[in-house]
């Protein structure tokens, strides 16, 4: 049994780091493998992660952590029974993938303005809470070419757009994702999308 693709890990900078790897053949990850992780810190203990299958030869493990600070560094040991398959290290602050925003809502009751709001996925005491910026994706269900991205570079988790920038009488969907420049993170996954029917009064044209 050998590791074909070494584990790569990302942290949500809150409580979970996710490590993925590939074996050289079909593997029952949860029965055959264990990923041990230990913070490089005085009097820390080794903790065990039981991996799950992620495709035939792929494995994924969700490492539970209490919280994360920039100094944290972990040793990782991948074991198959008594055999050490791979040894590595992981610094969560250097491999951050933020949590996806939630509760995306489209408020259509503001006069000819669409107000999109969502929730910051972090609690106020987490460092990323005040460092997230967002991308909002809006697209038409009827017209695949009608697809747009709005970059929200301020901290407030909301976006206002004029309803008239979208077509009237058509159903649209929106989703939002987050990233943090301070840690040069990857983008989060997209939030679940939300749907609304776009309708607004066309301005009366005078001839």
């Amino acid at each position: 049994m050998k590791v074909l693709q070494e584990p790569t890990c990302v942290s949500d900078y809150m409580s979970i780091s996710t490590c993925e790897w590939k074996m050289n053949g079909p593997t029952n990850c949860s029965t055959e493998l264990r990923l041990l992780y230990q913070l490089v810190f005085l009097l820390s203990e080794a903790h065990t992660c039981i991996p799950e299958n992620n495709g035939g030869a792929g494995c994924v493990c969700h490492l539970l952590m209490d919280d994360v600070v920039s100094a944290d560094n972990y040793t990782l040991d991948l074991w198959a029974g008594q055999q050490l398959l791979w040894k590595g290290s992981f610094k969560p602050s250097e491999h951050v993938k933020p949590r996806a925003p939630g509760n995306l809502t489209v408020h259509t009751n503001v006069s000819d303005t669409l107000l999109l709001t969502w929730s910051n996925p972090y609690p106020p005491d987490n460092y990323l809470y005040n460092h997230l910026t967002y991308a909002v994706n809006i697209w038409s269900e009827n017209d695949p070419a009608d697809f747009r991205i709005y970059n929200v570079t301020y901290l407030e988790p909301s976006l206002r757009i004029a309803a008239s920038t979208l077509k009237s009488g058509i159903s649209y969907r929106a989703r939002v994702r987050a990233w943090a420049q301070c840690y040069n993170t990857t983008w989060s996954e997209w939030s679940p999308s939300t749907k609304w029917h776009n309708s607004y009064r066309e301005p009366f044209e005078q001839h």
């Epitope: 913070l39 005085l42 009097l43 820390s44 080794a46 539970l64 952590m65 209490d66 944290d72």
Partner: antibody
């Protein structure tokens, strides 16, 4: 009441051995790292050794490395310090102390917040 | 090893007056924001040491609020706002960030 009680001290000749014990009560012993600190007569405090809650992680001062062994029996809520090849400079009061909560991924530290009453070790011929 | 240097080594104080003890580490004891691994202990005559302050500034349970700790990185201070007769003894700073734990030499606080 959270309490630590040391025992096992006494007079021993140079080159001899002693085993100190530290019985913990009033707290979940296995979840805490434990530490030994000593104090030579008229001197300051000196750290000796520490052990994590499971016993899987151990540290020693250079002055005792290879001679002293720290261990614990969580089923008995007891910490030990096996002292071999004793020297005159090991003469001191030995204290055990409750250290950080080591069951968390990053051990949670609240200082050495409980100390035993101390047990006296005298090494002399 | 991290060296902890305390000053002064002797501190005569009038009851009711403030007192301050300094502790300097040979390298930073800051692990992350708010986590300076420095403690302060008081050892009264014939007794075991008792914890006063941990993580640089957090007061231990049952410790009077006249005791406070401050500082970050390498420089730390223990302050007693109004010294009482019962505060006499030896005060030690200690670092617990890396092995070996190391103590300062101790400061003897006595009443004038």
């Amino acid at each position: 009441e959270v309490q630590l009680v040391e025992s096992g001290g006494g007079l021993e000749q140079p080159g001899g051995s002693l085993r100190l014990s530290c019985a913990g009560s009033g707290f979940t012993f296995r979840t805490y790292a434990m530490t030994w600190v000593r104090q030579a007569p008229g001197k300051g405090l000196e750290w000796v050794s520490s052990i994590s809650g499971s016993g899987g992680n151990i540290y020693y001062a250079d002055s005792v490395k290879g001679r002293f062994t720290i261990s614990r029996d969580n089923s008995k809520n007891t910490l030990y310090l096996q002292m071999n090849s004793l020297r005159a400079e090991d003469t001191a009061v030995y204290y055990c102390a409750k250290d950080r909560v080591s069951i968390y991924v990053r051990p949670r530290y609240y200082g050495l917040d409980v100390w035993g009453q101390g047990t006296t070790v005298t090494v002399s011929s | 090893d991290i060296v902890m240097t305390q000053s002064p080594l002797s501190l005569p104080v009038t009851p009711g007056e403030p007192a301050s003890i300094s502790c300097t580490a040979s390298q930073s004891l800051l692990y992350s924001i708010g986590y300076n691994y420095v403690d302060w202990y008081l050892q009264k005559s014939g007794q075991s040491p008792q914890l006063l302050i941990y993580l640089g500034s957090k007061r231990a349970s049952g410790v009077p609020d006249r005791f406070s700790g401050s500082g970050s990185g390498t420089d730390f201070t223990l302050k007693i706002s109004r010294v009482e007769a019962e505060d006499v003894g030896f005060y030690y700073c200690m670092q617990s960030l890396t092995s070996p734990y190391t103590f300062g030499q101790g400061t003897k606080l006595e009443i004038k």
